[in-house]
């Protein structure tokens, strides 16, 4: 479902030609400098060109726009607003373009924008209104269906004095504009936690990717409203155990498939319920691959092969018996 290029021929625009006519109003379907265009495929590619801003003279026919591998730095309000508007633009890929700031209303006036990829940009400043476009408590619905935000965490020294998770979630929830979102990818963002209200306000999600983060627990996260959720990727996190409430919620979702590989499962007495559930459920994909990381004596044991006798907790000694 990602934008793909067609075999149709692409026309390139030489930079000297563009500068020669820059004083003239742009032709409606010319190809911007440093870009390749295929009207037949309705695709414009401005890839690895070190562009510092979005071309102003994008052809009106564009449906798939690749602006990857550039140096855009900032995406201002109305970055894609044109007269006439880019009414057909459905898929926009801005990955790896060194964006560190996306301002409020950056994607306004794109009525058909279904798929947006901002991955691999160090987003130190993502406006809460980047996707909703306004600070109203309830905004006009965004047309976005797929939002790809993998590896958008900036280096630690470039982060603002606020929670990165909170910044991203604020942008996802603002104005309830993203209620139609069906795919959300948030992989590789060093998330330590998932704010409890985020999923409740994204009821149309079919696919959620939270892999390769640092999630330790899902205790306060509710999946109950995600009736349509089909895939939940939690591989490569820091999960130690899933508790009863989470297990019951996941089991209650009719279409869900959960991916839990490569988490440091702690196989002590708190794991008993999860092991029992794993043995019965069809929810978890590749459940036979899940192994214990702790305690040391249990390392590499397969969760499905454990029984209650294996899952013990060291007794907590009263203070008088504890040794230093």
């Amino acid at each position: 479902s990602s934008p793909t290029s067609s075999a149709s021929s692409f026309s390139s625009s030489a930079p000297f030609l563009a500068s020669a006519v820059s004083a003239q109003p742009p032709l409606p379907d010319q190809c911007p400098a440093l870009c390749e265009c295929s009207e037949a495929a309705r695709t414009v590619k401005c890839v690895n060109r070190n562009l510092t801003e979005v071309p102003t003279d994008l052809p009106a026919y564009v449906r798939n726009l690749f602006l990857t591998g550039n140096q855009l730095a900032v995406l201002p309000a109305g970055a894609f607003a044109r007269r006439p508007p880019l009414a057909e633009l459905a898929a926009l890929n801005l990955s790896g373009s060194r964006l560190d700031e996306v301002r409020a209303g950056a994607f306004e006036h794109l009525p058909s924008l279904r798929q947006l990829d901002l991955s691999h940009n160090p987003l130190a400043d993502l406006s809460p209104f980047a996707f909703s476009g306004s600070n109203a408590s309830v905004s006009a619905p965004s047309p976005l269906v797929e939002l790809i935000l993998n590896h958008i965490v900036p280096p630690e020294d470039e982060r603002q004095n606020r929670s990165f998770e909170g910044m991203v979630v604020a942008a996802l929830l603002a104005g309830r504009a993203l209620q139609g979102l069906r795919r959300l990818e948030l992989a590789s963002n060093h998330f330590l936690y998932l704010p409890r209200d985020v999923l409740a306000q994204l009821p149309s999600l079919r696919h959620l990717d939270l892999s390769n983060n640092s999630l330790v627990s899902l205790t306060y996260v509710s999946f109950r409203n995600l009736t349509h959720l089909e895939s939940l990727h939690l591989e490569d996190n820091a999960l130690k155990v899933l508790h009863n409430g989470t297990l019951a919620e996941l089991q209650g979702l009719p279409h869900i498939r959960v991916f839990l590989d490569n988490n440091p499962w702690v196989c002590d007495c708190h794991m008993a319920d999860m092991v029992t559930w794993l043995k019965e459920t069809e929810v978890v994909q590749g459940k036979d691959r899940l192994t214990c990381a702790y305690p040391e004596k249990m390392r590499n044991r397969v969760l499905l092969e454990l029984n209650s006798a294996d899952l013990d907790c060291d007794p907590i000694l009263p203070p008088s018996l504890q040794t230093s």
Partner: antibody, heavy 117, light 113 residues
Framework: QSVEESGGGLVQPGGSLRLSCAAS????????MSWVRQACGKGLEWIGI???????YYASWAKGRFTISRDNSKNTLYLQMNSLRAEDTAVYYC????????????WGQGTLVTVSS | DIVMTQSPDSLAVSLGERATINCQSS????????LSWYQQKPGQPPKLLIY???TLASGVPDRFSGSGSGTDFTLTISSLQAEDVAVYYC?????????????FGGGTKLEIK
């Protein structure tokens, strides 16, 4: 990527038939799959659908007589049809549902089922 | 049961002229825009033209467009070509607490005048 139906043929009223749909180039278990039928010179009629994890949903007229199942190891979808009637005579198509939108984005060529004595 | 009504049943349009087909659902489709249009030529399976009410499927010419929301939808062919002669079907997707339901319209046969 493609799907191919098989198993159609002539069956007597009251009889049973199992149609198969073999998927190539993609994993059947990763998609919702559906069966649709079309009587000669008539319109398309939705039969039912199987979700990725195996939940099934049917048109009201198909409940009880028609059963959709899947064998992931064989990458094959099935339609079990029981108590067949003359009005079940049709071309039966299997179709894949998009992973994001609830639309049929890949169709087989169909297999003809004729119910007649 | 959900009923999808297509109109007209058949349509004859001159080459180069606009063709318009309507589809009305007895209930709102899921998320108000889960409506697809298919083209079927004799002896062939249906081919997806438009999904999500207005999104053109890959490889479909620009002369096809879709519009509408909720219960009322339209397929438009801006300039009819000879290869557009076919039967066109709308299809809605529906969700309720009891699960999913799909329904097709009765079809519209498009011919050249």
């Amino acid at each position: 990527q493609s799907v191919e139906e098989s198993g159609g043929g002539l069956v007597q009223p009251g009889g049973s038939l199992r149609l198969s749909c073999a998927a190539s180039g993609f994993s059947l278990s990763s998609y919702w799959m559906s069966w649709v039928r079309q009587a000669c010179g008539k319109g398309l009629e939705w039969i039912g659908i199987i979700a990725g994890r195996g939940s099934t949903y049917y048109a009201s007229w198909a409940k009880g007589r028609f059963t959709i199942s899947r064998d992931n190891s064989k990458n094959t979808l099935y339609l079990q049809m029981n108590s067949l009637r003359a009005e079940d005579t049709a071309v039966y198509y299997c179709a894949r549902v998009s992973s994001i939108y609830y639309t049929f984005n890949l169709w087989g060529q169909g297999t003809l089922v004729t119910v007649s004595s | 049961d959900i009923v999808m009504t297509q109109s007209p049943d058949s349509l004859a349009v001159s080459l180069g002229e606009r063709a318009t087909i309507n589809c009305q659902s007895s209930q709102s489709v899921y998320s108000n825009n889960e409506l697809s249009w298919y083209q079927q030529k004799p002896g062939q399976p249906p081919k997806l033209l438009i999904y999500y009410a207005s999104t053109l499927a890959s490889g479909v010419p620009d002369r096809f467009s879709g519009s509408g929301s909720g219960t009322d939808f339209t397929l438009t062919i801006s300039s009819l070509q000879a290869e557009d002669v076919a039967v066109y079907y709308c299809q809605g997707s529906y969700y309720s607490g009891s699960g999913w339901y799909y329904a097709f319209g009765g079809g519209t046969k498009l011919e050249i005048k």
